[in-house]
């Protein structure tokens, strides 16, 4: 768990607490909220960083159809539980002691119950569709420039592997990027798509995670490209399991 | 053991073509990127562009832009880089480099295109 | 495009000797990347982001920097380290190096 070590901070998480107090003082980082080490050299897990920002100060190129399993993230934010790898806990509950099961990237799953509501393993979400529109340009942006440098994005800033990104829509002036990763192939190391797609998120809302680095300033061939609606659609390995009363509504 | 391995060293007139190939082993083709660089006689390294094995996603630097054209035959993992309107100053040592969350983290041993009439 | 220019071009050293290379962006990156290339050989990937050592490269070789200005430390010269360096970045296409750093025995 190493940070840079001539200033010792941490320059994928910003929100951390880092010290020279690992081995052979080595620069350790700490997560607010959870005070949970985390490597620097990767993105911190969603779970973590959910956590510490509800600890911190309040202030064919045809666009794809989300499937009806898809999920939305209409809850917003709350204080998740955060297993010992950083992970959300499949069952999340408030302090009001209502519960819910959540996937991978903590997104309610089901309905909401009690305390005896049961949520056996953490369902893994294998497909995120991110949905983009762009600001007016004067014309549309070469779909292989955009297609590349979105590729780019996820390599560079996120460390996202390239065979995670399956694929970059565009139809101006929506863009979709499909992040795909299986249980099977993710390997040890790899960044989860769930982690980057929340890095992403926050990058274009201006809220960059990294420490000293500046925004995302996102360019093709030179044009900017400026996001100014942004959805994301997550699909689980497992339909979610939501009463028809809610899916009527 | 991951492999690059690009076929041999090119003669060619003004105004030819030359298609440099890169065949890869030891790894999943598809999953990753294959970019070229080009290194004229003394000189430093050029960074030509870079294709997506996957998808097929292509991005050319400006300089090279109409003149060059990447491809990728994932049957038989590999890459190919053919140049068009060649003239004398592409006299070059051409390498073809693995990419991955690192630009490139394995190389082919390159291939000399040497330009002249 | 972001410009990287490094610092110098040529050195001479002796076996032991500490020798820094710098590499100055245009405009600020996340990440230098550096390479060592041999005569007749292909670039081989020393340093990635910034300060991580590529698997099997020896210890007496670091990195450091940020923003704009970054550097390739080798602590104690050895007779296989005569080559030339190139920093690299991607932080925005096109991807670009430096012009080279030849490291020659005095």
């Known amino acids: 768990h190493t940070a840079a070590q001539d200033n010792c901070t941490c320059p994928t998480n910003k929100m951390t607490v880092c010290s020279p107090d690992g081995p052979g003082g080595r620069c350790q980082c700490r997560a607010l909220g959870s005070g949970m080490a985390v490597d620097c050299s990767t993105l911190t897990s969603k779970c973590l960083l959910l956590k510490a920002r509800m600890s911190a100060p309040k202030n064919a190129r045809t666009l794809v159809r989300p499937s009806e399993h898809a999920l939305v993230d209409n809850d917003g934010l709350y204080d998740p539980d955060c297993d010992p790898e950083g992970r959300f806990k499949a069952r999340q509950c408030n302090q009001t002691s209502v519960c819910w099961c959540v996937n991978s990237v903590g997104v309610r799953r089901t309905d909401k119950g009690d305390l005896s509501l049961r949520c056996d393993e953490l369902v893994r979400t294998h497909h995120i569709l991110i949905d983009l529109r762009h600001r007016p340009t004067a014309g549309a942006f070469n779909h292989s420039d955009l297609d590349a440098e979105l590729r780019r994005l996820f390599r560079e800033r996120y460390r996202l592997h390239p065979k995670f990104v399956a694929a970059v829509h565009y139809e101006q002036p929506t863009i979709q990027i499909e992040l795909r990763q299986n249980t099977s192939q993710k390997a040890a190391g790899d960044v989860d798509i769930g982690d980057a797609a929340y890095y992403f998120e926050r990058d274009i809302k201006g809220e960059s995670l990294f420490q000293g680095r500046g925004g995302l300033d996102l360019r093709v061939r030179g044009e900017p490209l400026q996001v100014e609606r942004t959805l994301i659609y997550y699909l689980d390995e497992i339909p979610p399991k939501f009463s028809m009363k809610r899916l009527t509504a | 053991e991951v492999q690059l391995v690009q076929s041999g060293p090119e003669v060619k007139k003004p105004g030819a073509s030359v298609k440099v190939s890169c065949k890869a082993s030891?790894?999943?083709?598809?999953?990753?990127?294959i970019g070229w660089v080009r290194q004229a006689p003394g000189q430093g390294l050029e960074w030509i562009g870079e294709?997506?094995?996957?998808?097929?996603?292509?991005y050319y630097t400006e300089k090279f832009k109409g003149r060059v054209t990447m491809t990728a035959d994932t049957s038989t993992s590999t890459a190919y880089m053919e140049l068009s309107s060649l003239r004398s100053e592409d006299t070059a040592v051409y390498y073809c480099?693995?990419?991955?969350?690192?630009?490139?983290?394995?190389w082919g041993q390159g291939t000399l295109v040497t330009v002249s009439s | 495009d972001i410009q990287l220019t490094q610092s110098p071009s040529s050195l001479s050293a002796s076996v032991g000797d500490r020798v820094t290379i710098t590499c100055s962006a245009s405009s600020s990156v996340s990440y230098m990347y550096w390479y060592q290339q041999k005569p007749g050989k292909a670039p081989k990937l020393l340093i990635y982001?910034?300060?991580t050592l590529q698997s099997g490269v020896p210890s007496r070789f670091s990195g450091s920097g940020s923003g704009t200005d970054f550097t390739l430390t080798i602590s104690s010269l050895q007779p296989e380290d005569f080559a030339t360096y190139y920093c690299q970045q991607w932080s925005s296409y096109p991807y670009t190096f430096g012009q080279g750093t030849k490291l020659e025995i005095k």
């Open positions: 982001d910034t300060s």
């Open positions: 030891g790894f999943t083709f598809t999953d990753y990127v």
């Open positions: 294709i997506y094995l996957g998808s097929g996603t292509i």
């Open positions: 480099a693995r990419g991955s969350i690192f630009p490139f983290d394995y």
